[in-house]
Interface confidence: low
């Protein structure tokens, strides 16, 4: 969250790959985990604008992909998130950090692989149930963050093919016992619970039986509540803007927060020729703040109508909750009407802070 002015050239940047860093970090995550990649500036100096790339394609921020200048977070990772990730300088495309990420199918979460562990004809005439993949059943205690998907598996066989049923804390467990229900995939000997909550904690037992016998396995599930954090602001928003005198401008700010956020739009101003007050903090005016009739959606947009040269300057989206505060800033450049076309043609929109 740099407070400095970011010079940003929007348009085609020359693809000049820099030297590949000597070391490529190999990282392994479980399905459903949050992938976190950190890329501090080399030598601790300023890094400038950066872009995160996966398998050669720029990553687009979303509710699941949180992109910051020095950090990338991919929430609820799946197999598709495996690949080569790099953080590059936006203008030069020089690679600053490189990671090889593999997302494995942790036994605690993730989607089923189609057809895997299906009931198989073992060729045995008759027989009591037995575990076909005991090595996949080693992890008896599962601790997962709330909102993740959990899957318990008890792959088994027998002749005749055994049935499978599930107990929670020793009692029959059915879909109506939890909000969001459960998925019982008998062909894959699995129980799937999506978006787990603290009330899903407990002991889950699979009971596999046929007329020759019965086997069972108990798993213990602990649901970790999400640790609260200050609001997360979507990278790249608000974006720098260049506008013609008299036109309308919109700044956007996307806020993610577990706790109720308090959003404000600020404009940096000068008082008696100074940009900062006696406490060393910038002078600002509050342009938009939460009111009795304002929704969070409305607060995520700042609209400026019929802009004048006085509207030019730095604008800040500020979001706070009970944990702390986050802010992103952007600049508005206001051009005289007749200069606008020339500026756009020659520079592909140049934003100078």
């Amino acid at each position: 969250e740099s407070l400095g002015t970011e010079q940003r050239v929007v348009g085609r940047a020359a693809e000049v790959p820099g030297p590949e860093p000597g070391q490529q970090e190999q990282l392994v995550f479980g399905s459903g985990d949050a992938v976190e990649l950190s890329c501090p500036p080399p030598g601790g100096g300023p890094m400038g604008p950066t872009v995160w790339v996966k398998d050669g394609t720029g990553l687009v921020p979303s509710e699941r992909v949180l992109v910051g200048p020095q950090r990338l977070q991919v929430l609820n990772a799946s197999h598709e998130d495996s690949g080569a990730y790099s953080c590059r300088q936006r203008l030069t495309q020089r690679v600053l950090c490189h990671f090889s990420v593999r997302v494995t199918d942790a036994p605690s979460s993730g989607d089923d692989e189609d057809g895997e562990d299906e009931a198989e004809d073992t060729g045995v005439d008759t027989g009591a149930p037995y575990w076909t993949r005991p090595e996949r059943m080693d992890k008896k205690l599962l601790a997962v963050p709330a909102a993740n998907t959990v899957r318990f598996r008890c792959p088994a066989a027998g002749n005749p093919t055994p049935s499978i049923s599930w107990l929670k804390n020793g009692r029959e467990f059915r879909g109506e016992h939890r909000i969001g229900g459960i998925k019982l995939r008998h062909q894959q000997w699995s129980l799937v619970m999506e978006s787990v909550v603290p009330s899903d904690r407990g002991n889950y037992t699979c009971v596999v039986e046929n007329k020759f016998g019965s086997i069972r396995q108990t798993y213990t599930l602990d649901v970790l509540e999400r640790s609260p954090h200050r609001p997360i602001l979507q990278a790249g928003l608000p974006a720098n803007q260049t506008a013609v005198l008299g036109s309308d401008v919109e700044f956007h700010c996307k806020v993610y927060s577990d706790a109720q956020p308090h959003i404000q739009w600020l404009k940096h101003v000068e008082v008696n020729g100074s940009k900062v007050g006696p406490d060393g903090t910038p002078y600002v005016t509050v342009l938009k703040t939460a009111g009795a009739n304002t929704t969070d959606k409305e607060l995520e947009v700042l609209s400026l109508h019929n802009v004048t040269f006085e509207d030019a300057g730095e604008y800040t989206c500020l979001a706070g909750n009970s944990i702390g505060f986050s802010h992103h800033s952007a600049w508005l450049v206001v051009l005289p009407a007749e200069e606008e076309l020339v500026e756009a043609d020659e520079a592909g929109s140049v934003y100078a802070g």
């Epitope: 969250e1 007050g277 406490d279 903090t281 600002v284 509050v286 009970s322 702390g324 505060f325």
Partner: antibody, heavy 126, light 110 residues
Framework: QVQLVQSGAEVKKPGASVKVSCKAS????????MHWVRQAPGQGLEWMGW????????NYAQKFQGRVTMTRDTSISTAYMELSSLRSEDTAVYYC???????????????????WGQGTLVTVSS | DIALTQPASVSGSPGQSITISCTGT?????????VSWYQQHPGKAPKLMIY???NRPSGVSNRFSGSKSGNTASLTISGLQAEDEADYYC??????????FGGGTKLTVL
């Protein structure tokens, strides 16, 4: 839960110095500004200054400039306030108070003291 | 040293409403919407009751409300209860002194 635990009461002679500690727990110590506020017997609250535990940066009220020093030890999540050249009018309860301002956050006009220490009574008497 | 002026004391009967005023200048209360109110029981640390003029932290009763007009901020307590008896302090950002408190108001519930 957030807790600020201060050191015990002190009795000092005029001209001496006192150093009060404030141990934080239940949150990331380096993420929030720590302020010091004092209250003389039967009087109101008086703001003394803040320290940014992340950077060690400080800002003192004009009245205390030159006499107060605020420091921190991040390894034990503890903030300290040292007041020198004590006089009888410095007799007061000294509070540390966490403000909701993140140390990543520059917009310090909006200062909310959401958690307070229990207070340390400093008596200055000859 | 006291930059913000509060009445030394106010009183009211249970169930009544009372208002405590906090008067400053255009460089503090009047210039910014950053007025907070704290409640302090004898021998205890202060507790945040109102911030940003009129916002209540979670856990604070909705009997407490704040407002501002010009250079004066006000704290109103409705449906007065015995446990409301305490000292109340206003606090504001001040463009010269940074953080200033009022002198405090002793609330007595009759």
């Amino acid at each position: 839960q957030v807790q600020l635990v201060q050191s015990g009461a002190e009795v000092k002679k005029p001209g001496a110095s006192v150093k009060v500690s404030c141990k934080a727990s239940g949150y990331t110590f380096t993420s929030y500004y720590m302020h010091w506020v004092r209250q003389a017997p039967g009087q109101g609250l008086e703001w003394m200054g803040w320290i940014n535990p992340n950077s060690g940066g400080t800002n003192y009220a004009q009245k205390f400039q030159g006499r107060v020093t605020m420091t921190r030890d991040t390894s034990i999540s503890t903030a300290y306030m040292e007041l020198s050249s004590l006089r009888s009018e410095d007799t007061a309860v000294y509070y540390c108070a966490r403000s909701m301002n993140s140390t990543m956050y520059w917009y310090l006009r909006r200062v909310l003291f959401d958690h307070w220490g229990q207070g340390t009574l400093v008596t200055v008497s000859s | 040293d006291i930059a913000l002026t509060q009445p030394a004391s106010v009183s009211g009967s249970p169930g009544q409403s009372i208002t405590i005023s906090c008067t400053g200048t255009s460089s503090d209360v009047g210039g910014y919407n950053y007025v907070s109110w704290y409640q302090q029981h004898p021998g205890k640390a202060p507790k945040l009751m109102i911030y940003d003029v009129s916002n209540r932290p979670s856990g604070v009763s909705n009997r407490f409300s704040g407002s501002k007009s010009g250079n004066t901020a006000s704290l109103t307590i409705s449906g007065l209860q015995a446990e409301d008896e305490a000292d109340y302090y206003c606090q504001s950002y001040d463009m010269y002194n940074y953080i200033v408190f009022g002198g405090g108001t002793k609330l007595t519930v009759l």
